[in-house]
Interface confidence: medium
């Protein structure tokens, strides 16, 4: 079955049910219901789940049993529309019930929340997941689901339940492990960084998709594609972006059903036809369904062919140009965008994507021209300067994680952002430039054929946390202008932003500089995140503060952590010496 | 729906010429690599001749120098001229939509058109 075939199924629920399997079936509607209906106990979430399954079964039975041709955003927004406390625990969502399809799942969907109001997730000790595990599997791993899903509203759910089998195999590894905990917690660890960097590079396509439109994110898969796939001709490059244009588009709408099952299809087909696609395959497509599907998303790049000849001689040379480009300009920019991401597995696919524009917006103006040629001759000109700016950046930024590591230059960007955006809150500025500094352990140690595709393409993941999380509260025009002008350029959007000279600083509240002992229980992370915090808020009093005056204060406090925590009355001595810290800072930055 | 309907074929002396057109319509005609592929009577399939999206080209050996394939985008048209004709040319000429050329693979076929050489 081809991802676009459809037959003519009498049932949709009954056809989703056959095709993905109670299990999947019942994982998959969980997932949904909880990125929905975020707040929703566990316990109401399963009884929902349980309802539809039930429904569906009817169904397998009999298609033309009663509701069963109605379509799933019918059956699953009625289901959701069940919920007692529906007005009391969401507010406003509770007004999209009163809607019809599709404005009701539209309606719920834009009240998905980026940044729930959820307690943080807390481990507790191996042993008590170890017999919460054994004593009912069934639960435990629909709880993981749940958490998971309730937090990430937009995680790509076929992967989720790629991650959920990774984690039930964990389990079955670790509990019967002499060290229990030696061999759980590296693997549970592994799991939430990935997690955490799966939703987000999902986010990402669903805005996309969602703020860009469909031909945005088409130009992405298609550079992306191209250099993974340099071998595969144009046509199936083609083919292979419709089809996953498609599955996102499902994921992101939240028909997750329908998404699983197309993904599968997909995996299929490039399984079935990776002779004409890439080298890379065959060992991705020898595992079973998730791992394959996991396995082909993050392939390596093939090698490129040895034959290809010089762009220009199509592109630039070629009197046809400006006729090939009227003729389809989408399909003549998309062969444009092919043929120059496969030659360049070194350019990230934003800078690939800002080539494609600039080369669009020449054709534009020289194709009107009287001597179009002329007019668009040196066009492959204009790109070296759009080149070399990321280049020199991550240049630059490297050599300064190199010099003081990744708390250090963590810190460096903290002061650099809050200074460009001061109005943004300091969580979020504290998760966002933390993320934005991993970029050097993550990234400055590839050769530089690999430095710019990481960076770059890991800063537009971050910098669209970023810009979701603002969208939330808007308080920025300078966020909103860099998150919604231009995909491609946000980043450089960002790096020109200077110091907001508007701006102006915040009052001094000793508060928010009063630490307790609890600090000396954290652990490294969670002590480096209050210490971070603690270095906004200072940028946000002092925005004019230099580099010099920020390190003195911070070498100060953190002593004054390492004293207290070392005292044997440690409350005390934080109430003392803090005040003397504070004191101490004012005077040093003259606040 | 995708359809390829080929002409041009007919009876003709060895070292004489011939141009084959093909009508391509239901798909984007240009955003894909086109090829004439021919079988001989009683033999199988045997590729002749590939063009780009873009206009390279590419030849069977067999018939470097002699055939010209070409492209009309503008009329959702594919050609090939054949030059110095031999009889081991004869053979129903398809025109095909290329999905894949490495290997080769058509997804789309005409119902052919054919040339004979022969004096």
């Known amino acids: 079955r081809g991802v676009f075939r459809r037959d003519a199924h009498k049932s949709e629920v009954a056809h989703r049910f056959k095709d993905l399997g109670e299990e999947n079936f019942k994982a998959l509607v969980l997932i949904a219901f909880a990125q929905y209906l975020q707040q929703c106990p566990f316990e109401d979430h399963v009884k929902l789940v349980n309802e539809v399954t039930e429904f569906a079964k009817t169904c397998v039975a009999d298609e033309s049993a009663e509701n069963c041709d109605k379509s799933l955003h019918t059956l699953f927004g009625d289901k959701l529309c069940t919920v007692a406390t529906l007005r009391e625990t969401y507010g406003e969502m509770a007004d999209c019930c009163a809607k019809q399809e599709p404005e009701r799942n539209e309606c719920f969907l834009q009240h998905k929340d980026d940044n729930p109001n959820l307690p943080r997730l807390v481990r507790p000790e191996v042993d008590v997941m170890c017999t919460a595990f054994h004593d009912n599997e069934e639960t435990f791993l629909k709880k993981y689901l749940y958490e998971i899903a309730r937090r990430h509203p937009y995680f790509y759910a076929p992967e989720l339940l790629f991650f959920a089998k990774r984690y039930k195999a964990a389990f079955t590894e670790c509990c019967q492990a002499a060290d229990k905990a030696a061999c759980l917690l590296p693997k549970l660890d592994e799991l939430r960084d990935e997690g955490k960097a799966s939703s987000a590079k999902q986010r990402l396509k669903c805005a996309s998709l969602q703020k860009f439109g469909e031909r945005a994110f088409k130009a992405w898969a298609v550079a992306r594609l191209s250099q993974r796939f340099p071998k595969a001709e144009f046509a199936e490059v083609s083919k292979l972006v419709t089809d996953l244009t498609k599955v996102h588009t499902e994921c992101c709408h939240g028909d997750l059903l329908e998404c699983a099952d197309d993904r599968a299809d997909l995996a299929k087909y490039i399984c079935e036809n990776q002779d004409s696609i890439s080298s890379k395959l065959k060992e991705c497509c020898e595992k079973p369904l998730l791992e394959k599907s996991h396995c082909i998303a993050e392939v390596e790049n093939d090698e490129m062919p040895a034959d290809l000849p010089s762009l220009a001689a199509d592109f630039v040379e070629s009197k046809d140009v400006c006729k090939n480009y009227a003729e389809a300009k989408d399909v003549f920019l998309g062969m444009f965008l092919y043929e120059y991401a496969r030659r360049h597995p070194d350019y990230s696919v934003v800078l690939l994507l800002r080539l494609a524009k600039t080369y669009e917006t020449t054709l534009e103006k020289c194709c009107a021209a009287a001597d179009p040629h002329e007019c668009y001759a040196k066009v492959f000109d204009e790109f070296k300067p759009l080149v070399e700016e990321p280049q020199n950046l991550i240049k630059q930024n490297c050599e300064l994680f190199e010099q003081l590591g990744e708390y250090k230059f963590q810190n460096a960007l903290l002061v650099r952002y809050t200074k460009k955006v001061p109005q943004v809150s300091t969580p979020t500025l504290v998760e966002v430039s933390r993320n934005l500094g991993k970029v050097g352990s993550k990234c400055c140690k590839h050769p530089e054929a690999k430095r710019m595709p990481c960076a770059e393409d890991y800063l537009s993941v971050v910098l669209n946390q970023l810009c979701v999380l603002h969208e939330k509260t808007p308080v920025s025009d300078r966020v909103t202008k860099c998150c919604t002008e231009s995909l491609v350029n946000r980043r450089p959007c960002f790096s020109a932003l200077e110091v907001d000279e508007t701006y102006v600083p915040k009052e001094f509240n000793a508060e928010t500089f009063t630490f307790h002992a609890d600090i000396c229980t954290l652990s490294e992370k969670e002590r480096q995140i209050k210490k971070q915090t603690a270095l906004v808020e200072l940028v946000k009093h002092k925005p004019k503060a230099t580099k010099e005056q920020l390190k003195a204060v911070m070498d100060d406090f953190a002593a004054f952590v390492e004293k207290c925590c070392k005292a044997d009355d440690k409350e005390t001595c934080f109430a003392e010496e803090g005040k003397k810290l504070v004191a101490a800072s004012q005077a040093a930055l003259g606040l | 729906e995708v359809q390829l309907l080929e002409s041009g074929g007919g009876l003709v002396q060895p070292g004489g010429s011939l141009r084959l057109s093909c009508a391509a319509s239901?798909?984007?005609?240009?955003?894909?690599?086109m090829a004439w592929v021919r079988q001989a009577p009683g033999k199988g399939l045997e590729w002749v001749s590939t063009i780009h999206q873009t206009g390279f080209t590419y030849y069977a050996d067999s018939v470097k120098g002699r055939f010209t394939i070409s492209r009309d985008n503008s009329k959702n048209t594919l050609y090939l001229q054949m030059n110095s004709l031999r009889a081991e040319d004869t053979a129903v000429y398809y025109c095909a939509k290329v999905r894949s050329m490495r290997p080769y693979k058509f997804d789309y076929w005409g119902q052919g058109t054919l040339v004979t050489v022969s004096s």
């Open positions: 239901g798909f984007t005609f240009m955003a894909y690599q």
